[in-house]
């Protein structure tokens, strides 16, 4: 799987999950989240050569098409597969609230 | 929805489904499919600005991050959302067979 275990410990050039830290205030302009100040969101990057963790029958056909038509703009793209939630603390008035923000952290990628 | 109804009738520059015809023999090197000779597979293409048919909470965060960090390589990507099957006819010996190939045609796209 193109997950953090594999991708963070290798020099993989193809589609893989990459490290990305997002600071809520600096990067998103969000002041309302009290904790954490930021988080390891990660992101997906890298080419999707034939056959690299392809998602569907369509992506296999498209990758094959791309190999035979290298100049084509139609190609599979490296996108998140498994996402995890992020617990945050924010305030409503003076009252702290704990919330799970779903689908916030990328754990693995796929070619779609 | 970024589907064929909308995308094929507009000059949309952002993520949208685009027309792509694949000829089985010329583009894939497949001689074994008797009918059809090719099909309208379509593909997804275009930038994913904030907020353009974003898939998950993560893709919203990433698009926002991208707005604040325009030079970053981390950005959502335009990929298939709804896929449809393709019926084909091929031969096993002299006997024609009809098969539905699943997930072969892109009907709509999303930013993931």
């Amino acid at each position: 799987a193109l997950d953090t275990n594999y991708c963070f410990s290798s020099t993989e050039k193809n589609c893989c999950v990459r490290q990305l830290y997002i600071d809520f205030r600096k990067d998103l302009g969000w002041k309302w989240i009290h904790e954490p100040k930021g988080y390891h969101a990660n992101f997906c990057l890298g080419p999707c050569p034939y056959i690299w963790s392809l998602d569907t029958q369509y992506s296999k056909v498209l990758a094959l098409y791309n190999q035979h038509n290298p100049g084509a703009s139609a190609a599979p793209c490296c996108v998140p597969q498994a996402l995890e939630p992020l617990p945050i603390v924010y305030y409503v008035g003076r009252k702290p609230k704990v919330e799970q923000l779903s689908n916030m952290i990328v754990r693995s990628c796929k070619c779609s | 929805a970024l589907d064929t109804n909308y995308c094929f009738s507009s000059t949309e520059k952002n993520c949208c489904v685009r027309q792509l015809y694949i000829d089985f023999r010329k583009d894939l090197g497949w001689k074994w499919i008797h009918e059809p000779k090719g099909y309208h597979a379509n593909f997804c293409l275009g930038p994913c600005p904030y907020i353009w048919s974003l898939d998950t909470q993560y893709s919203k965060v990433l698009a926002l991050y991208n707005q604040h960090n325009p030079g970053a390589s981390a950005a959502p990507c335009c990929v298939p959302q709804a896929l449809e099957p393709l019926p084909i006819v091929y031969y096993v010996g002299r006997k024609p067979k009809v098969e539905q190939l699943s997930n072969m045609i892109v009907r709509s796209c999303k930013c993931s």
Partner: nanobody, 114 residues
Framework: QVQLVESGGGLVQPGGSLRLSCAAS????????MGWFRQAPGKQREMVAI??????SYVDSVKGRFTISRDNAKNTLALQMNSLKPEDTAVYFC?????????WGPGTQVTVSS
């Protein structure tokens, strides 16, 4: 059900050659592609070469050194590997995609070392 069996792997010196073969048995029809893939220790499985009915494709690192060939009458696939390098060391797998379903052989080890 399709079965695949590879043969021809072994130990070879840098610059040497090997020929891998793959025999396919079962009901072979509706073949999207047949191909050779390899997996080095701690790496993802990667494509080496694939063949459709009248087309072949190679990963950049083997172009000009490896040749894939297919005999449809005998349901066999071969990979001629010349000018082998230490970085070609891996387990090599034969693959057949039939109507969208992937079938794999058990693999054959290729080691390039002096």
């Amino acid at each position: 059900q399709v079965q695949l069996v590879e043969s021809g792997g072994g130990l070879v010196q840098p610059g040497g050659s090997l020929r891998l073969s793959c025999a396919a048995s079962g009901s072979i029809f509706g073949v999207f592609y047949m191909g050779w893939f390899r997996q080095a220790p701690g790496k993802q499985r990667e494509m080496v070469a694939i063949s459709t009915d009248d087309r072949t494709s190679y990963v950049d690192s083997v172009k000009g050194r490896f040749t894939i060939s297919r005999d449809n009458a005998k349901n066999t696939l071969a990979l001629q590997m010349n000018s082998l390098k230490p970085e070609d060391t891996a387990v090599y797998f034969c693959n057949l995609n039939q109507l969208g379903t992937d079938y794999w052989g058990p693999g054959t080890q290729v080691t390039v070392s002096s």
